[in-house]
């Protein structure tokens, strides 16, 4: 003979557990159907009548299959600096991560609870690593031979250019400023050629310089104040 | 829906200690309270400890209280029993169920359970 099905609600054997979308009520000390998501249990089960359902009201939802009394309120709109990704609706709840240049400085269940703006590095210092969904941008002192001149969350050291003749060296924040190999009658005090570059940037190898046929005073032109060390802008 | 397997069981002297751990699979354990069961043969399933989904609030058995620590990880979708100065009457096999948005303790019911762990305290 085929086994009998049982209609919930119904005693379980004992050891036994419930079925698929049954629970154990504690109280009625049967197994009882659960609420499919988007609904709660209006009605407990009894030992002689089965769980009683209804949808979510407006702003609240279950995202489970359950016999909760009431819905989940859903969270509170997304602020300014979050974007909705996924909206309220009676089976799920709403969703805000960090619009782009944010991350997360404060995870909730699911989404972000606060956002923070993303570090930018100063000129004299790179991305050292980037920031993501979770985590801030790390900056790094620009090391020798490699520079930076931007405010930025994404900008990393580049390389020096590298010069036939250098007119002015390049530091931590200014990139090398190169002469023309031809020597200039008509030079006005101060003035600075456009770089010429011998080679790409992406050589990291810097030669020795050539003896420069710029003035050697253009080697004391003052650079600007120093960043501080951090290097990071408290944007 | 949550599967869960219960490890940590093992054989250990009076007043030794076992970390029992409760592993969620198919769903992630942190919309659900937790409860942990016991069975000795031939008596009733009693509900030991439990945590709710938020994870704000615990409960204990009288039997229990001062002994076990309940404990969640939601970032492991792990739950644990830490139980210490055990003794002869804390063997059982122990389980441990679920309850979806479960917001009090003892859980007013029950979801799907684990095979369960044995834990023997004897000299």
């Known amino acids: 003979l085929p086994a009998q099905v049982a209609f919930t609600p119904y005693a379980p054997e004992p050891g036994s557990t419930c079925r698929l979308r049954e629970y154990y009520d504690q109280t009625a000390q049967m197994c009882c159907s659960k609420c499919s998501p988007g609904q709660h249990a209006k009605v407990f089960c009894t030992k002689t009548s089965d769980t009683v359902c209804d949808s979510c009201e407006d702003s609240t939802y279950t995202q489970l299959w359950n016999w909760v009394p009431e819905c989940l309120s859903c969270g509170s709109r997304c602020s300014s600096d979050q974007v909705e990704t996924q909206a309220c609706t009676r089976e799920q709840n709403r969703i805000c991560t960090c619009r782009p240049g944010w991350y997360c400085a404060l995870s909730k269940q699911e989404g972000c609870r606060l956002c923070a703006p993303l570090r930018k590095c100063r000129p004299g210092f790179g991305v050292a690593r980037p920031g993501t969904e979770t985590s801030d941008v790390v900056c790094k002192p620009c090391a020798p031979g490699t520079f930076s001149n931007t405010t930025s969350s994404t900008d990393i050291c580049r390389p020096h250019q590298i010069c036939n003749v250098v007119a002015i060296p390049g530091n931590a924040s200014m990139d090398a400023v190169c002469t023309s190999t031809s020597p200039t009658r008509s030079m006005a005090p101060g003035a600075v050629h456009l770089p010429q570059p011998v080679s790409t940037r992406s050589q990291h190898t810097q030669p020795t310089p050539e003896p420069s046929t710029a003035p050697s005073t253009s080697f004391l032109l003052p650079m600007g104040p120093s960043p501080p060390a951090e290097g990071s802008t408290g944007d | 829906e949550v599967q869960l397997v219960e490890s940590g069981g093992g054989l250990v002297q009076p007043g030794g200690s076992l970390r029992l751990s409760c592993a969620a699979s198919?769903?992630?354990?942190?919309?659900?309270?937790v409860a942990w069961f016991r069975q000795a043969p031939g008596k009733e399933r009693e509900e030991v400890s439990c945590?709710?989904?938020?994870?704000?609030?615990?409960n204990y058995a009288d039997s229990v209280k001062g002994r076990f620590t309940i404990s969640r990880d939601n970032a492991k979708n792990m739950v644990y029993l830490q139980m210490n100065k055990l003794k002869p009457e804390d063997t059982a096999r122990y389980y441990c169920t679920t309850e979806p948005y479960g917001s009090s303790c003892p859980l007013s019911g029950y979801d799907t359970w684990g095979q369960g762990t044995q834990v023997t305290v004897s000299s």
């Open positions: 945590i709710t989904y938020s994870g704000g609030s615990t």
């Open positions: 198919g769903s992630r354990l942190d919309y659900y309270a």
